[in-house]
């Protein structure tokens, strides 16, 4: 007789997973002399005991611990760039501005990042069908726990002046729902971080509106200055101008507004 | 540096079986997914089938199934490709590479080859 | 044994600009599914040139590009050089056979 099998909503555990995991993680630590030391097998084991085994609706930050204190890395507090619903600009700027970090540029965010997982209760299985959906299913999955655990982690560590990259092209620029604004945006130490500075991306190439003044920036900078924490705000323009001045800092067109 | 290097040059008898090695030197083959990739002389690659040791699995390709054999020993950082039932057209030179993920999820390629290693089928 | 259809060869004199192309099917080029490209110089074994469609391994010259459109997929190769010359192959795993399939494989050659 066939095992029943849960269905979720959500798209199921990405092919490959272990693999995945593992090749990023050998990848990883070839690339980051600092992080040479880490046993990537030990890694994918905490990884695995996260979830395996367990109710995917039932997964909590401490299931994640381990693989935590596999994964603790030192970034520079003060070169840490935040940003919501626009990752591939973040990422491309932090390619070029080797010195900034986001999130997927450390181990763990970079082992998961894309990638969708999880696993059964009372089976050593993992599930390639389906994983819940954090809407229709249930928010304590393990992807969704993993960005929460992950994510506060790097607000906690941030300091000085924060970076974070916003999508101007977004009905709600800033979203109270997005982990940025549930998870991380709390999670700044006043004690440590002086400044937020916000970055907002516009999308149309002749769109000259000041999008500092959108009603959930102002909002954001509420929650914020609540905080204790002083807020700015600037608007990029031109992402493409704003990624080609990033390389060539030097180029005289860079002067100008971007 | 990482680097595979595979055993020496084989003459085999039609009907009899092949064991070529490749050894991890300068990196843990037990983090690695090695595949065995040939090539007949003056034709194309062929992809024959890989194995993931951290996980104990290995696959080959329908065309292989019956006659590849697969397999690693960690504990030597050394990974084998055993193909039995040999005839001429399997005359090639047999490369192992380790296949290492891209820039997205779902995504490989072979990013380090071993230099190949000659096997002639002749009676 | 199902394999993606490479020109046999293309040629072009030094600091021309050549591409080569790769077709393949729904269930390979097609599918959600990426495809490298690798070089083979004479006598020696592959090294890969291009992955993920368009991304460069570092060490690799910016002359060499690649891009995928539906089913197919191309590799470019600008400011064309005598040690250029070699097969050039493209790859990507196939759904429907559950292995990787390669080009028939390219012979450049340098005028």
């Known amino acids: 007789v066939p095992r029943w099998r849960q269905q979720w909503s959500g798209p199921g555990t990405t092919k490959r997973f272990p693999e995945t995991v593992l090749a990023r993680c050998v990848k990883y630590t070839e690339i980051h002399p600092e992080m040479r030391h880490v046993d990537c097998q030990s890694v994918w084991d905490a990884f695995k005991g996260a979830f395996i085994s367990k109710h995917p609706c039932n997964i909590t930050e401490e299931d994640y611990q381990p693989l935590m204190k596999l994964g603790t890395q030192t970034v520079p507090c003060n070169k840490i760039l935040l940003w919501s619903r626009i990752k591939d600009l973040a990422h491309q700027f932090t390619q070029v501005q080797r010195d900034m970090f986001t999130l997927e540029d450390t181990l763990l965010g970079y082992l998961a990042d894309d990638l969708t997982w999880c696993g059964e209760f009372n089976t050593s299985k993992i599930n390639y069908q389906s994983c819940p959906d954090w809407r229709k299913d249930c928010s304590n999955n393990p992807v969704s726990v993993f960005w929460k655990t992950v994510s506060r982690r790097f607000a906690e560590a941030a300091c000085d002046v924060v970076h974070v990259m916003l999508n101007g092209s977004r009905s709600k620029i800033f979203d109270k729902n997005s982990t940025f604004g549930s998870v991380e945006v709390h999670n700044l130490q006043p004690e440590k971080v002086q400044t937020l500075e916000a970055w907002v991306i516009h999308g149309g190439r002749e769109d000259s509106r000041d999008l500092c003044q959108d009603p959930t920036i102002k909002e954001l900078e509420s929650i914020i200055s609540k905080r204790n924490i002083q807020f700015s705000c600037k608007n990029i323009y031109r992402p493409d101008k704003f990624l080609q001045c990033v390389k060539n800092p030097e180029d005289s067109s860079c002067t100008s507004e971007i | 540096q990482v680097q595979l290097v595979q055993s020496g040059a084989e003459v085999k008898k039609p009907g009899s079986s092949v064991k070529v090695s490749c050894k991890s030197s300068?990196?843990?083959?037990?983090?690695?997914?090695i595949n065995w990739v040939r090539q007949a002389p003056g034709q194309g690659l062929e992809w024959m089938g890989r194995i993931t040791p951290f996980l104990g699995e290995s696959e080959s390709a329908q065309k292989f199934q019956n006659r590849v054999t697969i397999t690693a020993d960690t504990s030597i950082n050394t990974a084998y490709m055993e193909l039995s039932s040999l005839r001429s057209e399997d005359t090639a030179v047999y490369y192992c590479?380790?296949?290492?993920?891209?820039?997205?999820?779902?995504?490989?390629?072979?990013?380090?080859w071993g230099r190949g290693t000659l096997v002639t089928v002749s009676s | 044994q199902s394999v993606l259809t490479q020109p046999a060869s293309v040629s072009g004199s030094p600091g021309q600009s050549i591409t080569i192309s790769c077709t393949g099917t729904?269930?390979?080029?097609?599918?959600?599914?990426?495809v490298s490209w690798y070089q083979q110089l004479p006598g020696t074994a592959p090294k890969v040139l291009s992955y993920s469609n368009d991304h460069r391994p570092s060490g690799v010259p910016d002359r060499f590009s690649g891009s995928k459109s539906g089913t197919s997929a191309s590799l470019a190769i600008s400011g064309l050089q005598s040690e250029d010359e070699a097969d050039y192959y493209c790859a990507a795993w196939d759904d429907s056979l559950n292995n990787y399939v390669f080009g028939t494989g390219t012979k450049v050659t340098v005028l």
């Open positions: 590479a380790r296949e290492t993920v891209g820039a997205t999820a779902a995504d490989w390629y072979f990013d380090l």
């Open positions: 729904s269930s390979d080029v097609g599918a959600y599914n990426y």
């Open positions: 300068g990196g843990t083959l037990r983090n690695y997914v």
